[in-house]
């Protein structure tokens, strides 16, 4: 009786770890303001919290600058990025700016880097006005793989919101590849 | 041997409680807007649907224009909110508007409340166009405690579009808290 | 003692199937560009992209433009759509422009349609600048029947930008109905 | 100090026009909304016009509309209102106002402004 009870256990056992959602990775990282490259042109970002206010990581690596998967599974990804400038800061290069975000997977095994999402717009950005706003939003559902490794690239980082309610972006896990 | 059942059956009622995802907390709330305030400065809006339409809640609460967290977890949380202008409804004192939105979290123990997202952009509405529309989405992962409760300031709430499909915002738990 | 093991075993892998998060519908469809209509008005976009790229389908069907929910469940919906226009694509009819999205919910046993999410924006896209960008990102938890069709509508089709990470769309299930 | 100087009122017939200026000073012009009021003999004072901080956007009390035009030069830092077909019922002290937008249509209440210039008297005769 006992050994079926074990057998019986142990597939419980082992449905339990499989389902426990507790398990399940995320990651919830926020910009790194101290740190933030200038210029116009597209860069990737690599400084970012992990465990400071809102950001957190479970099941996942932040490792240079990138988010690493460790746990092969369908995930959601989502970013959040925002610009913003005042007069004060002195006045802009040009009024019209292209303000993206490019979220990329690249994988080490075969050493490429892809587009997942993109998003943002072109403003116009007048000296007629103090202070100018712009956020971004992008999210979808992907397969990742362990050691896949994601990051954000964007253009005029220097015009990036520093707050952690502004400049973020994660991921959590949805349920196993079949 | 019964015993031995019972004891197992026991635990896997336990496991099917605890992972049974029906028991998962949502919500996704939508404007009411027979009671949104007047002003161009930040407010909070505290007057939403949670049961008709596309309106819904499970296992959390809604009071006082707050969304209540009532189990601890991560949940995913997002909002959508559209701002309209049609020439009819009147003229706009600057064109120079700042369309924004934050998700904040209140906690009753520690009274403080904390942006959790922001998003928006300022937009140039001139006279010249008949009709001005513009939607901002934000999204992310956060853990939320029993008790806490969620938010949304806009500013410029007069110029909201007060339809469903719209103006709303959501939640839903992903996981437990380890 | 076996019919007792049959019995809990029995329970156990319905609760397995049940739970088994690898049985959870989603879908993620990137936009087909060579057959995108032309016009400025709000049109159905019924060519998307399920088995290629980040483009992907389980649980779900995909069948004349339109996602087709196989299974009960609440769902968490999302969509980004990216538009785009160069100069050396020839001359805007207009400079202000309506660049929106809706997602749509159709039920077949009563043939009715409605709109669950919309976002967008009015633009001024002058001859000024060479290029212009602007994107969309809408998301939101619905509760969706077998036999339910999402479908997206745009205005200014022609417009879109064709990459598989600026225009998608997609869905997970996320639980069960009660 | 701010102040707004109102100037352009005088006697007129009925039926003429007439072009009222309000030079503004010590705040960012550009950033305010402006208005113009008006006080008749023995009554309250009441909206006559207001124009946004760009100028894209004006309202009007519906007695003075298709008649009076209000518009701003940022660059001048003024607000004009052109007065044209003058009515008998026209004669007032009419004052320039300023505030920053803190709704988002254009306000239409004296309370609703900060800022007030002395006024100038128009006199329409019959």
């Known amino acids: 009786i006992r050994a079926e009870k074990a057998m019986v256990d142990g597939s419980w056992l082992d449905l339990a770890k499989r389902s426990k959602l507790e398990a399940q990775p995320f990651a919830h990282l926020t910009i790194n303001a101290t740190d933030i490259p200038s210029g116009s042109h597209k860069v990737s970002l690599s400084s970012w919290y992990h465990d400071r206010g809102w950001a957190k990581i479970s099941n996942m690596t932040f490792s240079n600058g990138k988010l690493i998967v460790n746990q092969d599974g369908f995930y959601y990804l989502y970013a959040n990025i925002c610009f913003r400038h005042h007069e004060t800061s002195g006045d802009l290069a040009t009024e019209y700016l292209q303000l993206m975000v490019y979220v990329t997977k690249t994988s080490i095994k075969i050493p490429s880097s892809h587009t997942l999402m993109k998003g943002g717009s072109t403003k116009y950005w007048s000296g007629n006005s103090e202070f100018h706003f712009y956020s971004i939003n992008v999210g979808g559902f992907f397969k990742l793989r362990s050691g896949e490794e994601i990051s954000i690239e964007v253009s005029n980082p220097s015009l990036l919101d520093p707050d952690q309610d502004a400049t973020y972006f994660g991921a959590f896990k949805v349920r196993d590849i079949d | 041997i019964r015993a031995e059942k019972a004891m197992v059956d026991g635990s896997w009622l336990d496991l099917a409680k605890r992972s049974k995802l029906e028991a998962q907390p949502f919500a996704h709330l939508t404007i009411n807007a027979t009671d949104i305030p007047s002003g161009s400065h930040k407010v909070s809006l505290s007057s939403w649907y949670h049961d008709r339409g596309w309106a819904k809640i499970s296992n959390m609460t809604f009071s006082n224009g707050k969304l209540i967290v009532n189990q601890d977890g991560f949940y995913y949380l997002y909002a959508n909110i559209c701002f309209r202008h049609h020439e009819t409804s009147g003229d706009l004192a600057t064109e120079y508007l700042q369309l924004m939105v934050y998700v904040t979290k209140t906690s009753i123990k520690i009274p403080s409340s904390h942006t959790l997202m922001k998003g928006g952009s300022t937009k140039y509405w001139s006279g010249n166009s008949e009709f001005h529309f513009y939607s901002i989405n934000v999204g992310g992962f956060f853990k939320l405690r029993s008790g806490e409760e969620i938010s949304i300031e806009v500013s410029n709430p007069s110029l909201l579009d007060p339809d469903q499909d719209a103006t709303y915002f959501g939640a839903f738990k992903v996981r437990d808290i380890d | 003692i076996r019919a007792e093991k049959a019995m809990v075993d029995g329970s156990w892998l319905d609760l397995a199937k049940r739970s088994k998060l690898e049985a959870q519908p989603f879908a993620h469809l990137t936009i087909n560009a060579t057959d995108i209509p032309s016009g400025s008005h709000k049109v159905s976009l019924s060519s998307w992209y399920h088995d290629r790229g980040w483009a992907k389908i389980s649980n779900m069907t995909f069948s004349n433009g339109k996602l087709i929910v196989n299974q009960d469940g609440f769902y968490y919906l999302y969509a980004n759509i990216c538009f785009r226009h160069h100069e050396t694509s020839g001359d805007l009819a207009t400079e202000y422009l309506q660049l929106m999205v809706y997602v749509t919910k159709t039920s077949i046993k009563i043939p009715s349609s409605h709109t669950l999410m919309k976002g967008g924006s009015t633009k001024y896209w002058s001859g000024n600048s060479e290029f212009h960008f602007y994107s969309i990102n809408v998301g939101g938890f619905f509760k969706l029947r077998s036999g339910e069709e999402i479908s997206i509508e745009v205005s200014n089709p022609s417009l879109l930008d064709p990459d598989q990470d600026a225009t998608y769309f997609g869905a997970f299930k996320v639980r069960d109905i009660d | 100090e701010v102040q707004l100087v109102e100037s352009g009122g005088g006697l007129v017939q009925a039926g003429d026009s007439l072009r009222l200026s309000c030079a503004a000073a010590?705040?960012?012009?550009?950033?305010?909304?402006m208005g113009w009021f008006r006080q008749a003999p023995g009554k309250e004072r009441e909206f006559v016009a207001a124009?946004?901080?760009?100028?894209?956007?004006?309202g009007y009390v519906d007695s003075v509309k298709d008649r009076f035009t209000i518009s701003r030069d940022n660059t001048k830092n003024t607000v004009y209102l052109q007065m044209a077909s003058l009515k008998p019922e026209d004669t007032a002290v009419y004052n320039c106002?300023?505030?920053?937008?803190?709704?988002?249509?254009?306000?239409?209440?004296?309370?609703?402004?900060?800022?007030w210039g002395q006024g100038t008297q128009v006199t329409v005769s019959s």
């Open positions: 106002a300023a505030t920053t937008p803190t709704t988002s249509y254009l306000p239409r209440s004296e309370r609703q402004y900060e800022y």
């Open positions: 124009i946004s901080t760009g100028g894209t956007w004006t």
């Open positions: 010590g705040f960012t012009f550009r950033r305010y909304v």
